[in-house]
Interface confidence: low
Amino acid sequence: HNTTVFQGVAGQSLQVSCPYDSMKHWGRRKAWCRQLGEKGPCQRVVSTHNLWLLSFLRRWNGSTAITDDTLGGTLTITLRNLQPHDAGLYQCQSLHGSEADTLRKVLVEVLADPLDHRDAGDLWFPGESESFEDAHVEHSISRSLLEGEIPFPPTS
């Protein structure tokens, strides 16, 4: 699996989309998990409704929400009030029995809010080498940006 990079601004919301084949994954619940290390386990953050027919209902775990368009084949995860510690590697998963298929590997990057000096010390270097083949970026800033527009908050 290639890794898709989603970038969001600290303090704002980030929306991650995971497209999938709706026929292949018909009847399967979905989940969003956080990868613990490059080869470590993927820790479940939130999953869709226990009843697959109600997968369209948004479910929350803390500041993370999940909803599934089972007809269109798009799983959507919302990270509300994004923080530097939310940065890292995640997976969208399709569940069947005790198994889980990876729909998409996602790298969440957090762009710091320049006016929030409290977070200035929370920017991190990775503790170990990471390698992602053919990663590409999806800018998912929570408000629409015009070409070349800067998402820095205005200075007073």
Partner: nanobody, 112 residues
Framework: ESGGGLVQPGGSLRLSCAAS????????MHWYRQAPEKERELVAI?????????NYADSVKGRFTISRDNAKNMVYLQMNNLKPEDTAVYYC?????????WGQGTQVTVSS
């Protein structure tokens, strides 16, 4: 970080930052600065991959340019038309989970 020094107002400097220990091209990079008795300030951001996403603080817009060379694991800050208020220690950094590490920074002094 390197490339700092003493420069007169209106002058230019190019700062360099060498990164290692991670897949550099996949990460957003930042330049920060910290002047004496002031908070650390985010100056510029460059996105991952081709670095087409760039972002600047209002105070440096039009004067500073951030760029990156993924093949060399380098990020640069070209600073033109420098002003005395640009005097600070400049740091580069990356957003990711791990251990906090700011490096030593590089001193930029703008004075006549």
């Amino acid at each position: 970080e390197s490339g700092g020094g003493l420069v007169q107002p209106g002058g230019s400097l190019r700062l360099s930052c060498a990164a290692s220990g991670f897949a550099f091209g996949n990460y957003v990079m930042h330049w920060y600065r910290q002047a004496p008795e002031k908070e650390r300030e985010l100056v510029a951001i460059i996105g991952s991959q081709g670095g087409t996403y760039t972002n600047y603080a209002d105070s440096v817009k039009g004067r500073f340019t951030i760029s990156r060379d993924n093949a060399k694991n380098m990020v640069y800050l070209q600073m033109n038309n420098l002003k005395p208020e640009d005097t600070a220690v400049y740091y580069c950094n990356v957003v990711y989970i791990g251990r906090p590490n700011w490096g030593q920074g590089t001193q930029v002094t703008v004075s006549s």
